[in-house]
Amino acid sequence: PEPPTACREKQYLINSQCCSLCQPGQKLVSDCTEFTETECLPCGESEFLDTWNRETHCHQHKYCDPNLGLRVQQKGTSETDTICTCEEGWHCTSEACESCVLHRSCSPGFGVKQIATGVSDTICEPCPVGFFSNVSSAFEKCHPWTSCETKDLVVQQAGTNKTDVVCGPQDRLRA
Protein backbone atom coordinates (compact mmCIF):
# COMPACT_ATOMS: atom_id res chain seq x y z
CA PRO A 1 0.00 0.00 0.00
CA GLU A 2 1.02 3.60 -0.60
CA PRO A 3 2.56 5.27 2.47
CA PRO A 4 0.29 7.97 3.92
CA THR A 5 1.02 11.65 3.44
CA ALA A 6 -1.35 12.80 6.19
CA CYS A 7 -2.59 11.21 9.40
CA ARG A 8 -5.75 11.27 11.49
CA GLU A 9 -6.27 13.48 14.51
CA LYS A 10 -4.13 12.43 17.47
CA GLN A 11 -1.60 10.83 15.10
CA TYR A 12 1.69 11.95 13.55
CA LEU A 13 3.61 10.94 10.45
CA ILE A 14 7.04 9.41 10.84
CA ASN A 15 9.02 7.03 8.61
CA SER A 16 6.08 7.06 6.15
CA GLN A 17 3.85 5.75 8.91
CA CYS A 18 1.07 7.16 11.08
CA CYS A 19 1.80 6.76 14.79
CA SER A 20 -0.49 7.59 17.71
CA LEU A 21 0.42 10.70 19.67
CA CYS A 22 0.96 10.32 23.42
CA GLN A 23 -1.98 11.44 25.53
CA PRO A 24 -1.75 14.48 27.86
CA GLY A 25 0.32 13.60 30.92
CA GLN A 26 2.61 11.26 28.97
CA LYS A 27 5.80 11.70 26.93
CA LEU A 28 7.11 9.83 23.87
CA VAL A 29 9.63 7.06 24.51
CA SER A 30 9.62 5.36 21.13
CA ASP A 31 7.81 5.87 17.81
CA CYS A 32 5.51 3.15 16.57
CA THR A 33 6.54 0.63 13.91
CA GLU A 34 4.40 -1.37 11.53
CA PHE A 35 4.07 -3.92 14.35
CA THR A 36 4.33 -1.95 17.60
CA GLU A 37 2.26 0.85 19.10
CA THR A 38 3.78 4.20 20.08
CA GLU A 39 5.53 3.82 23.44
CA CYS A 40 4.64 6.53 25.96
CA LEU A 41 5.54 7.06 29.61
CA PRO A 42 3.78 9.12 32.30
CA CYS A 43 5.40 12.43 33.24
CA GLY A 44 7.27 12.41 36.54
CA GLU A 45 6.49 14.27 39.74
CA SER A 46 6.45 18.06 39.17
CA GLU A 47 6.17 17.58 35.37
CA PHE A 48 3.32 17.92 32.89
CA LEU A 49 2.24 17.82 29.25
CA ASP A 50 -1.13 19.38 28.50
CA THR A 51 -1.72 18.23 24.90
CA TRP A 52 -1.63 15.10 22.75
CA ASN A 53 2.05 15.13 21.88
CA ARG A 54 5.25 13.52 20.63
CA GLU A 55 7.49 15.34 23.14
CA THR A 56 10.40 13.32 24.51
CA HIS A 57 10.54 15.46 27.67
CA CYS A 58 7.75 16.69 29.93
CA HIS A 59 7.62 20.36 30.98
CA GLN A 60 8.50 21.37 34.54
CA HIS A 61 5.67 22.77 36.65
CA LYS A 62 5.90 26.52 37.20
CA TYR A 63 7.51 27.51 40.51
CA CYS A 64 5.57 30.08 42.51
CA ASP A 65 8.49 31.96 44.07
CA PRO A 66 7.49 33.47 47.44
CA ASN A 67 10.41 35.89 47.10
CA LEU A 68 8.50 37.43 44.20
CA GLY A 69 5.28 37.57 46.21
CA LEU A 70 3.86 34.48 44.53
CA ARG A 71 1.89 31.58 45.99
CA VAL A 72 0.21 28.48 44.52
CA GLN A 73 -3.36 29.07 43.46
CA GLN A 74 -3.79 25.63 41.85
CA LYS A 75 -1.35 22.74 42.15
CA GLY A 76 -0.20 21.29 38.83
CA THR A 77 -1.00 17.75 37.69
CA SER A 78 0.61 15.53 35.04
CA GLU A 79 -1.71 17.25 32.53
CA THR A 80 -1.79 20.84 33.82
CA ASP A 81 0.73 23.46 34.88
CA THR A 82 0.76 25.00 38.35
CA ILE A 83 -1.18 28.28 38.52
CA CYS A 84 0.42 31.02 40.60
CA THR A 85 -1.26 34.02 42.17
CA CYS A 86 -0.03 36.84 44.39
CA GLU A 87 -0.06 37.18 48.16
CA GLU A 88 -2.75 39.33 49.77
CA GLY A 89 -2.27 42.98 48.90
CA TRP A 90 -0.31 42.20 45.72
CA HIS A 91 -1.23 41.48 42.09
CA CYS A 92 0.42 39.91 39.00
CA THR A 93 2.45 42.09 36.66
CA SER A 94 1.46 39.98 33.61
CA GLU A 95 -0.99 37.33 32.48
CA ALA A 96 1.69 34.68 33.06
CA CYS A 97 1.94 35.93 36.67
CA GLU A 98 5.71 35.70 36.95
CA SER A 99 6.01 38.42 39.59
CA CYS A 100 3.85 40.63 41.80
CA VAL A 101 3.54 44.30 42.72
CA LEU A 102 1.77 45.99 45.59
CA HIS A 103 -1.83 47.06 44.95
CA ARG A 104 -2.10 50.75 44.08
CA SER A 105 -3.95 53.05 46.50
CA CYS A 106 -6.42 55.67 45.36
CA SER A 107 -5.32 59.18 46.42
CA PRO A 108 -7.59 61.68 48.21
CA GLY A 109 -10.19 62.91 45.74
CA PHE A 110 -10.32 59.43 44.18
CA GLY A 111 -12.21 56.36 45.29
CA VAL A 112 -11.92 52.66 44.55
CA LYS A 113 -14.03 51.69 41.53
CA GLN A 114 -12.80 48.06 41.55
CA ILE A 115 -10.89 46.41 44.35
CA ALA A 116 -7.67 44.70 43.21
CA THR A 117 -7.46 40.92 42.86
CA GLY A 118 -4.49 38.57 42.64
CA VAL A 119 -4.34 39.27 38.93
CA SER A 120 -5.59 42.85 38.52
CA ASP A 121 -4.66 46.20 40.09
CA THR A 122 -6.94 48.59 41.94
CA ILE A 123 -9.08 50.72 39.60
CA CYS A 124 -9.61 54.28 40.87
CA GLU A 125 -12.17 56.86 39.79
CA PRO A 126 -12.42 60.60 40.57
CA CYS A 127 -15.04 61.36 43.19
CA PRO A 128 -17.96 63.03 41.36
CA VAL A 129 -19.81 66.06 42.68
CA GLY A 130 -21.58 65.07 45.89
CA PHE A 131 -18.87 62.56 46.85
CA PHE A 132 -15.45 62.74 48.50
CA SER A 133 -12.48 60.73 49.66
CA ASN A 134 -10.06 62.20 52.15
CA VAL A 135 -7.74 59.20 52.47
CA SER A 136 -5.27 57.28 50.33
CA SER A 137 -6.73 53.76 50.24
CA ALA A 138 -6.88 50.57 48.19
CA PHE A 139 -10.35 49.75 49.52
CA GLU A 140 -12.32 52.94 50.25
CA LYS A 141 -14.93 54.11 47.76
CA CYS A 142 -15.95 57.74 47.37
CA HIS A 143 -18.34 58.60 50.21
CA PRO A 144 -21.40 60.80 49.67
CA TRP A 145 -21.33 64.20 51.29
CA THR A 146 -23.24 64.39 54.54
CA SER A 147 -26.81 65.56 54.03
CA CYS A 148 -27.14 68.50 56.45
CA GLU A 149 -30.87 68.79 55.75
CA THR A 150 -31.67 65.34 57.11
CA LYS A 151 -30.01 66.39 60.37
CA ASP A 152 -31.97 69.62 60.43
CA LEU A 153 -28.68 71.46 59.89
CA VAL A 154 -27.39 73.77 57.22
CA VAL A 155 -24.23 73.70 55.09
CA GLN A 156 -21.66 75.92 56.68
CA GLN A 157 -18.80 74.86 54.39
CA ALA A 158 -19.23 73.35 50.97
CA GLY A 159 -17.79 69.90 50.28
CA THR A 160 -15.12 69.11 47.70
CA ASN A 161 -13.90 65.85 46.13
CA LYS A 162 -11.50 65.60 49.09
CA THR A 163 -13.59 66.92 51.98
CA ASP A 164 -17.06 66.44 53.35
CA VAL A 165 -19.46 69.37 53.81
CA VAL A 166 -19.45 71.05 57.21
CA CYS A 167 -22.92 71.31 58.75
CA GLY A 168 -23.97 73.85 61.33
CA PRO A 169 -27.10 74.99 63.19
CA GLN A 170 -29.66 77.04 61.31
CA ASP A 171 -29.78 80.81 62.19
CA ARG A 172 -33.15 81.33 63.98
CA LEU A 173 -34.78 84.77 63.71
CA ARG A 174 -36.07 86.08 67.03
CA ALA A 175 -39.67 87.28 67.22
Epitope: S30, T33, F35, T36, E37, E39
Partner: antibody, heavy 117, light 110 residues
Framework: EVQLLESGGGLVQPGGSLRLSCAAS????????MHWVRQAPGKGLEWVAV????????YYVDSVKGRFTISRDNSKNTLYLQMNSLRAEDTAVYYC??????????WGQGTLVTVSS | QSVLTQPPSASGTPGQRVTISCSGS????????VYWYQQLPGTAPKLLIY???QRPSGVPDRFSGSKSGTSASLAISGLRSEDEADYYC???????????FGGGTKLTVL
Protein backbone atom coordinates in the same frame (compact mmCIF):
# COMPACT_ATOMS: atom_id res chain seq x y z
CA GLU B 1 12.75 -5.80 34.84
CA VAL B 2 11.95 -6.37 31.15
CA GLN B 3 12.37 -10.07 30.39
CA LEU B 4 11.67 -12.69 27.70
CA LEU B 5 11.90 -16.39 28.48
CA GLU B 6 11.68 -19.05 25.74
CA SER B 7 10.68 -22.67 26.33
CA GLY B 8 9.50 -25.72 24.41
CA GLY B 9 12.70 -26.62 22.57
CA GLY B 10 14.01 -30.17 22.36
CA LEU B 11 14.80 -33.10 20.11
CA VAL B 12 12.27 -33.91 17.39
CA GLN B 13 12.30 -36.24 14.38
CA PRO B 14 12.17 -34.88 10.80
CA GLY B 15 8.56 -34.27 9.82
CA GLY B 16 7.58 -33.79 13.48
CA SER B 17 6.08 -30.79 15.25
CA LEU B 18 7.02 -28.58 18.18
CA ARG B 19 5.51 -25.50 19.80
CA LEU B 20 7.81 -22.87 21.26
CA SER B 21 6.63 -20.35 23.87
CA CYS B 22 8.05 -17.00 24.92
CA ALA B 23 6.84 -15.60 28.24
CA ALA B 24 7.13 -11.82 28.53
CA SER B 25 7.29 -9.79 31.74
CA UNK B 26 8.15 -6.28 32.90
CA UNK B 27 6.50 -4.39 30.01
CA UNK B 28 3.15 -3.89 28.29
CA UNK B 29 3.31 -6.99 26.06
CA UNK B 30 0.05 -6.16 24.25
CA UNK B 31 1.58 -2.94 22.82
CA UNK B 32 4.59 -4.57 21.15
CA UNK B 33 5.23 -6.53 17.99
CA MET B 34 7.28 -9.68 18.59
CA HIS B 35 9.80 -11.62 16.49
CA TRP B 36 11.32 -15.07 16.32
CA VAL B 37 14.98 -15.19 15.23
CA ARG B 38 17.02 -18.37 14.95
CA GLN B 39 20.69 -19.31 14.87
CA ALA B 40 21.90 -22.63 13.52
CA PRO B 41 24.91 -24.10 15.39
CA GLY B 42 28.03 -22.11 14.48
CA LYS B 43 26.08 -19.95 12.00
CA GLY B 44 24.66 -16.43 11.86
CA LEU B 45 21.30 -14.97 12.86
CA GLU B 46 18.24 -15.58 10.66
CA TRP B 47 14.95 -13.74 11.14
CA VAL B 48 12.02 -16.19 11.14
CA ALA B 49 8.74 -14.36 11.76
CA VAL B 50 7.05 -11.30 13.22
CA UNK B 51 3.58 -10.66 14.64
CA UNK B 52 2.06 -7.24 15.30
CA UNK B 53 0.96 -6.12 18.78
CA UNK B 54 -2.68 -7.14 18.14
CA UNK B 55 -1.96 -10.22 16.01
CA UNK B 56 -3.39 -8.65 12.85
CA UNK B 57 -0.15 -8.72 10.85
CA UNK B 58 2.21 -11.68 10.42
CA TYR B 59 5.24 -12.07 8.17
CA TYR B 60 7.54 -15.07 7.68
CA VAL B 61 10.85 -15.82 6.03
CA ASP B 62 10.26 -17.80 2.78
CA SER B 63 11.89 -20.98 4.10
CA VAL B 64 9.26 -21.49 6.84
CA LYS B 65 6.11 -20.25 5.07
CA GLY B 66 3.30 -22.80 5.26
CA ARG B 67 5.12 -24.80 7.97
CA PHE B 68 5.51 -22.34 10.88
CA THR B 69 2.78 -20.23 12.51
CA ILE B 70 3.46 -17.30 14.82
CA SER B 71 0.73 -16.39 17.32
CA ARG B 72 0.25 -14.62 20.63
CA ASP B 73 -2.00 -14.58 23.67
CA ASN B 74 -1.96 -11.07 25.11
CA SER B 75 -3.99 -12.16 28.15
CA LYS B 76 -1.14 -14.55 29.04
CA ASN B 77 1.72 -12.26 27.90
CA THR B 78 2.96 -15.12 25.74
CA LEU B 79 4.27 -15.47 22.19
CA TYR B 80 4.18 -18.80 20.34
CA LEU B 81 5.80 -20.45 17.33
CA GLN B 82 4.06 -23.59 16.07
CA MET B 83 6.56 -25.54 13.95
CA ASN B 84 5.28 -28.35 11.71
CA SER B 85 6.96 -30.54 9.06
CA LEU B 86 10.31 -29.92 10.71
CA ARG B 87 13.52 -30.44 8.73
CA ALA B 88 17.14 -30.95 9.71
CA GLU B 89 17.91 -27.40 8.53
CA ASP B 90 15.48 -26.03 11.16
CA THR B 91 17.93 -27.11 13.88
CA ALA B 92 18.89 -23.93 15.72
CA VAL B 93 18.64 -21.90 18.87
CA TYR B 94 15.36 -19.98 18.62
CA TYR B 95 15.21 -16.51 20.20
CA CYS B 96 12.16 -14.33 20.74
CA UNK B 97 12.78 -10.59 20.51
CA UNK B 98 10.71 -7.47 21.13
CA UNK B 99 10.00 -5.11 18.24
CA UNK B 100 10.59 -1.39 18.67
CA UNK B 101 11.52 1.62 16.54
CA UNK B 102 14.92 1.05 18.16
CA UNK B 103 15.10 -2.40 16.54
CA UNK B 104 14.98 -5.74 18.36
CA UNK B 105 15.61 -4.12 21.70
CA UNK B 106 15.00 -7.04 24.09
CA TRP B 107 15.99 -10.67 23.49
CA GLY B 108 15.32 -13.92 25.32
CA GLN B 109 18.09 -16.35 26.21
CA GLY B 110 17.03 -18.81 23.47
CA THR B 111 15.77 -22.40 23.31
CA LEU B 112 17.49 -25.15 21.31
CA VAL B 113 15.52 -27.11 18.71
CA THR B 114 17.24 -30.20 17.31
CA VAL B 115 15.69 -32.00 14.33
CA SER B 116 17.29 -35.42 13.95
CA SER B 117 16.37 -39.04 13.52
CA GLN C 1 23.99 -16.87 1.60
CA SER C 2 22.86 -13.77 3.51
CA VAL C 3 21.01 -10.87 1.86
CA LEU C 4 23.33 -8.40 3.62
CA THR C 5 27.07 -8.96 3.10
CA GLN C 6 29.59 -8.61 5.92
CA PRO C 7 33.24 -9.64 6.10
CA PRO C 8 33.43 -12.92 8.05
CA SER C 9 36.20 -11.65 10.31
CA ALA C 10 37.94 -8.52 11.56
CA SER C 11 40.68 -7.93 14.08
CA GLY C 12 42.55 -5.23 15.91
CA THR C 13 44.77 -4.58 18.90
CA PRO C 14 43.58 -2.89 22.12
CA GLY C 15 43.14 0.85 21.63
CA GLN C 16 42.87 0.55 17.87
CA ARG C 17 39.89 1.56 15.69
CA VAL C 18 38.19 -1.09 13.58
CA THR C 19 35.40 -0.80 11.02
CA ILE C 20 32.93 -3.49 9.95
CA SER C 21 31.09 -3.03 6.66
CA CYS C 22 27.61 -4.17 5.66
CA SER C 23 26.51 -4.12 2.02
CA GLY C 24 22.92 -4.43 0.83
CA SER C 25 20.59 -3.24 -1.90
CA UNK C 26 17.99 -0.56 -2.64
CA UNK C 27 15.20 -2.68 -1.12
CA UNK C 28 16.85 -2.98 2.30
CA UNK C 29 19.69 -0.66 3.35
CA UNK C 30 18.95 1.75 0.49
CA UNK C 31 15.43 2.50 1.71
CA UNK C 32 15.38 1.53 5.40
CA UNK C 33 17.27 2.01 8.65
CA VAL C 34 20.22 -0.18 9.58
CA TYR C 35 20.61 -1.83 12.99
CA TRP C 36 23.66 -3.47 14.54
CA TYR C 37 23.72 -6.28 17.11
CA GLN C 38 26.54 -7.60 19.26
CA GLN C 39 26.64 -11.23 20.33
CA LEU C 40 29.18 -12.09 22.99
CA PRO C 41 30.28 -15.75 23.11
CA GLY C 42 27.53 -18.01 24.49
CA THR C 43 24.98 -15.23 24.97
CA ALA C 44 21.92 -13.80 23.21
CA PRO C 45 22.39 -10.90 20.77
CA LYS C 46 22.18 -7.34 22.13
CA LEU C 47 21.11 -4.18 20.33
CA LEU C 48 24.15 -1.99 19.69
CA ILE C 49 23.11 0.66 17.12
CA TYR C 50 19.63 1.58 15.89
CA UNK C 51 18.38 3.85 13.08
CA UNK C 52 21.79 3.89 11.35
CA UNK C 53 23.70 5.79 14.04
CA GLN C 54 21.79 5.95 17.33
CA ARG C 55 23.13 4.29 20.49
CA PRO C 56 20.78 2.81 23.11
CA SER C 57 21.48 3.95 26.66
CA GLY C 58 24.30 1.94 28.19
CA VAL C 59 26.19 1.45 24.91
CA PRO C 60 29.57 3.23 25.08
CA ASP C 61 30.24 6.06 22.62
CA ARG C 62 33.19 4.05 21.32
CA PHE C 63 30.60 2.38 19.08
CA SER C 64 29.25 4.38 16.14
CA GLY C 65 27.24 3.61 13.04
CA SER C 66 26.88 5.24 9.64
CA LYS C 67 25.04 4.63 6.38
CA SER C 68 25.60 5.77 2.80
CA GLY C 69 23.47 4.60 -0.08
CA THR C 70 23.16 0.81 0.07
CA SER C 71 26.03 0.29 2.52
CA ALA C 72 26.50 0.77 6.24
CA SER C 73 29.38 0.45 8.64
CA LEU C 74 30.04 -0.01 12.34
CA ALA C 75 33.12 1.63 13.85
CA ILE C 76 34.65 0.66 17.18
CA SER C 77 37.32 2.97 18.55
CA GLY C 78 39.55 2.39 21.55
CA LEU C 79 39.19 -1.37 21.07
CA ARG C 80 38.96 -3.46 24.27
CA SER C 81 39.25 -7.17 24.91
CA GLU C 82 35.58 -7.31 25.97
CA ASP C 83 34.60 -6.16 22.45
CA GLU C 84 35.55 -9.60 21.13
CA ALA C 85 32.23 -10.86 19.76
CA ASP C 86 30.16 -11.47 16.64
CA TYR C 87 28.59 -8.36 15.07
CA TYR C 88 25.50 -8.46 12.83
CA CYS C 89 23.87 -5.79 10.71
CA UNK C 90 20.14 -5.96 9.96
CA UNK C 91 17.49 -4.06 7.98
CA UNK C 92 13.90 -4.44 6.83
CA UNK C 93 13.66 -5.59 3.21
CA UNK C 94 10.72 -4.14 1.27
CA UNK C 95 10.89 -6.79 -1.47
CA UNK C 96 10.93 -9.73 0.92
CA UNK C 97 8.54 -8.11 3.45
CA UNK C 98 10.83 -9.31 6.21
CA UNK C 99 13.94 -8.58 8.19
CA UNK C 100 17.33 -9.55 6.80
CA PHE C 101 20.61 -10.03 8.67
CA GLY C 102 24.19 -9.95 7.54
CA GLY C 103 26.18 -13.15 7.88
CA GLY C 104 28.00 -11.74 10.90
CA THR C 105 31.56 -10.58 11.50
CA LYS C 106 33.73 -12.26 14.14
CA LEU C 107 35.85 -9.57 15.79
CA THR C 108 39.08 -10.72 17.40
CA VAL C 109 41.04 -8.48 19.76
CA LEU C 110 44.69 -9.48 19.37
Amino acid sequence: EVQLLESGGGLVQPGGSLRLSCAASGFSFSSYGMHWVRQAPGKGLEWVAVISYDGSKKYYVDSVKGRFTISRDNSKNTLYLQMNSLRAEDTAVYYCARDSSRGFDVWGQGTLVTVSS
Amino acid sequence: QSVLTQPPSASGTPGQRVTISCSGSSSNIGSNYVYWYQQLPGTAPKLLIYRNNQRPSGVPDRFSGSKSGTSASLAISGLRSEDEADYYCAAWDDSLSGWVFGGGTKLTVL
